[in-house]
């Protein structure tokens, strides 16, 4: 018969090690990103990043984290994205809601949009990085 | 009850393409990634490549690049890998395998089709 | 893309023995790492997932166990129908390569 598996007990260092790959990999984009010259950030968009009621990892709004790099993997063809995504999955609990992005259609606003979700997806994975250490450390505590 | 069936076995000549199904019932995940796999006669397993069926995101081994797609039809919960310009050495049983678990990212492939047998031959 | 070396390539054992199976990732992969048996003519079956987390009607005589960048596949006790070979495959990222494979023979 089908039955739900075991819930999988993950050591804290596989949560540090996904984030810490995620914060390098939007380091990564975000350079890529930034070399587009002319284009402003918008204060139209807005990434979700950490929800105060969890606790890490599981504070990271990782499903809507990803339909919003997705977004940008469809506007621009940036492979990094893949890895991000990859990494994301190991984040999402397989029964996560599906998260909707209404996309820019004006050329220039999908470049705002891109440089602005990707600035805040590099400061969100520093704030989520964090946010693991210090939870850690206060467990040690 | 999980179940992959696999479509039956195919004698291809060289240069032409193959199309493998790979039907799903029994399962219920929404967020996840399959995978397809194939073991030519006497050798090991070899990764072709996944699909994200929920959106049709896909990865494919180097090796395979441009040679393989992946498709998904969601509404028929069935997965395809199509094969072209095949050669003599892609003779191979070519396996689907779904994962179980809490996250959508895989960590083991828990259920594998019967596996479809392919043969290129002139 | 990221190795995976699996040693030894084939081995023989006696009936009641110990078995390892190694299986070393060209960089760290975490946890990310599946151990399946795969019997002659047969489908390949998912041993141990999460680096040592046993599948649903596993036999308790395999374990899985990991230290850095080492992963071992344990037969406690070797027994007849353990006969097939095994194969380690990872999950860090794409693409998923698999190990070369052990086969596993009765002495």
């Known amino acids: 018969s089908h039955t739900l598996p075991v819930r999988l007990l993950r050591p804290s260092d596989d949560v540090q090690k996904i984030v810490e790959e995620l914060q390098s990999l939007s380091k990564m984009l975000l350079k890529d990103v930034e070399e587009e010259k002319g284009v402003l950030v918008s204060q139209n968009y807005t990434l979700p990043c950490l929800s105060p009621d969890a606790q890490p990892p599981n504070n990271i709004h990782s499903p809507a984290i990803r339909a919003y790099l997705k977004t940008i993997r469809q506007l621009d063809n940036k492979s990094v994205i893949d890895e991000i995504i990859e990494h994301l999955d190991k984040l999402i609990f397989q029964d996560a809601p599906e998260t909707n992005i209404s996309v820019p259609t004006d050329t220039h606003e999908c470049k705002r949009f891109i440089l602005t979700i990707s600035q805040q997806f590099s400061e969100c994975m520093d704030l989520a990085l964090k946010s693991l250490t210090s939870g850690a450390q206060q467990a040690t505590t | 009850q999980v179940q992959l069936v696999q479509s039956g076995a195919e004698v291809k000549k060289p240069g032409s393409s193959v199309k493998v199904s790979c039907k799903a019932s029994g399962y219920t995940r929404t967020r996840y990634w399959m995978q397809w796999v194939r073991q030519a006669p006497g050798q090991g397993l070899e990764w072709m490549g996944a699909i994200y069926p929920g959106e049709g995101d896909t990865r494919y081994s180097q090796k395979f690049k441009g040679r393989v797609t992946i498709t998904a039809d969601k509404s028929t919960s069935t997965a395809y890998m199509e094969l072209s310009s095949l050669r003599s050495e892609d003779t191979a049983v070519y396996y689907c395998a779904f994962p179980e678990g809490q996250y959508a990212a895989p960590y083991g492939m828990h259920y594998w089709g019967q596996g479809t047998t392919v043969t290129v031959s002139s | 893309a990221i190795q995976m070396t699996q040693s030894p390539s084939s081995l023989s054992a006696s009936v009641g023995d110990r078995v390892t199976i190694t299986c070393r990732a060209s960089?760290?992969?975490?946890?990310?790492l599946a151990w399946y048996q795969q019997k002659p003519g047969k489908v390949p079956k998912l041993l141990i997932y999460y680096a040592k987390t046993s599948a649903e009607g596993v036999p308790s005589r395999f374990s899985g166990s990991r230290s850095g960048t080492d992963y071992t596949l344990t037969i406690s006790s070797l027994q007849p129908e353990d006969v097939a070979t095994y194969y380690c495959q990872h999950f860090w990222k794409t693409p998923w390569t698999f190990g070369g494979g052990t086969k596993v023979e009765i002495k």
């Open positions: 960089r760290n992969i975490g946890n990310y």
